[in-house]
């Protein structure tokens, strides 16, 4: 039988490549059974992750997965770095791996690269 | 259960362009990491690179120096590699593999492909 | 790049003898969210390898109990608690913690 734990699914190392001034979504896969968690994101500072108050976030319910979503509106050059969501479920937290935003400044940036570029290149956008 | 199959030429001629496919079954690639080792004759492994299926994103080792491009179709559950610019030395047996990339709870290898680089 | 050494990388052992493969790593494996992405492959004469332990210590399904891995940081060993013909190939070590992965040279287990 299907295990009724709470699980986050965020991959390990995972990275996006974002602009300034774009809109974003950053999602949270939560898999639950029968009572949705409180869910809350936090961002990494060196090893403690600081918790994000008055953003604004949002459920999605899809058939087998509710995704918990930061909203970015929009992105700006201080939203670079790693994000992890957690979930309180039955006074446990469980934690998902971090993702990271690359947070490209178009201002600094002499055009504007493609998604390829990025993705194959992701220390291109470290600024 | 989760298998691998790569496809391929197994001659490219120097100053060409290797082009490898891998498909998967028994899993969703969107669910995990897709990733390329390779092993020259009598020699160890090498780690080319990875991609994430879900969103395209990669890493590369940089030895490759920009020759390496790895994608995926996640319509066709499949991944590539193309090597540019190849020479005798990278005659190896290729191989792709798969790992869950949430939990590490799989990562399995498909079978490998000799490719041999020869005019 | 972080470098991947394995001893011995030749290992002559008798049927039903215990093997043990150390493993070191040039920079400590501890990730971030306090877990240690080391593995360890076994690679048969003419086959593709297959990942035998993960996370240090863990071991995949269908794997026998006679293998064990364990250590920290920098420090790894693979033991097979009595080798059995199957065994006989070569094993490496890999880590899964910094970019880009890297390998160990590989430790070539056959019969004494």
């Known amino acids: 039988k299907e295990s009724c734990d709470v699980q986050l699914y965020i991959k390990r190392q995972s990275y996006h490549s974002i602009f300034a001034g774009d809109p974003f979504k950053l999602e949270c896969p939560v898999k639950y059974c029968a009572h949705r968690p409180q869910v809350t994101w936090c961002k990494l500072n060196g090893t403690t992750c600081v918790k994000l108050e008055g953003r604004h976030t949002s459920w999605k319910q899809e058939k087998n997965l509710s995704f918990f979503i930061l909203h970015f509106e929009p992105v700006l050059p201080s939203d670079n770095g790693s994000y992890r969501c957690s979930a309180n479920f039955l006074s446990a937290i469980i934690e998902s791996h971090s993702t990271t935003l690359y947070v490209t400044d178009v201002k600094s940036a002499s055009e504007r690269p493609s998604k390829d570029e990025m993705a194959s290149r992701p220390w291109l956008l470290y600024s | 259960q989760v298998q691998l199959q790569e496809s391929g030429p197994g001659l490219v001629k120097p100053s060409g362009t290797l082009s490898l496919t891998c498909a998967a079954s028994?899993?969703?690639?969107?669910?995990?990491?897709m990733y390329w080792v390779r092993q020259p004759p009598g020699k160890g492994l090498e780690w080319i690179g990875r991609?994430?299926?879900?969103?395209?994103?990669?890493r590369y080792n940089p030895s490759f120096k920009s020759r390496a491009t790895i994608s995926a179709d996640k319509s066709k559950n499949q991944a590539s590699l193309k090597l540019s610019s190849v020479t005798a030395a990278d005659t190896a047996v290729y191989y792709c593999?798969?790992?869950?990339?949430?939990?590490?709870?799989?990562?399995?290898w498909g079978q490998g492909t000799l490719v041999t680089v020869s005019s | 790049d972080v470098v991947m050494t394995q001893s011995p990388l030749s290992l002559p052992v008798t049927l039903g003898q215990p093997a043990s493969i150390s493993c070191r790593s040039s920079?400590?494996?501890?990730?971030?969210?306090?877990?240690?992405?080391l593995n360890w492959l076994q690679q048969r004469p003419g086959q593709s390898p297959r990942r035998l332990i993960y996370?240090?210590?863990k071991r995949d399904s269908g794997v026998p109990d006679r293998f064990s891995g364990s250590g920290s940081g920098t420090d790894f060993t693979l033991k097979i608690s009595r080798v059995e013909a199957e065994d006989l190939g070569v094993y490496y070590c890999?880590?899964?913690?910094?970019?880009?992965?890297?390998f160990g040279q590989g430790t070539k287990l056959e019969i004494k």
């Open positions: 593999a798969v790992y869950d990339g949430y939990y590490e709870s799989f990562d399995v």
């Open positions: 028994g899993v969703n690639i969107k669910d995990t990491y």
């Open positions: 991609i994430d299926p879900a969103n395209g994103y990669t």
């Open positions: 920079q400590s494996l501890l990730d971030s969210d306090g877990k240690t992405y």
């Open positions: 996370l240090v210590s």
């Open positions: 890999w880590q899964g913690t910094l970019f880009p992965r890297t």
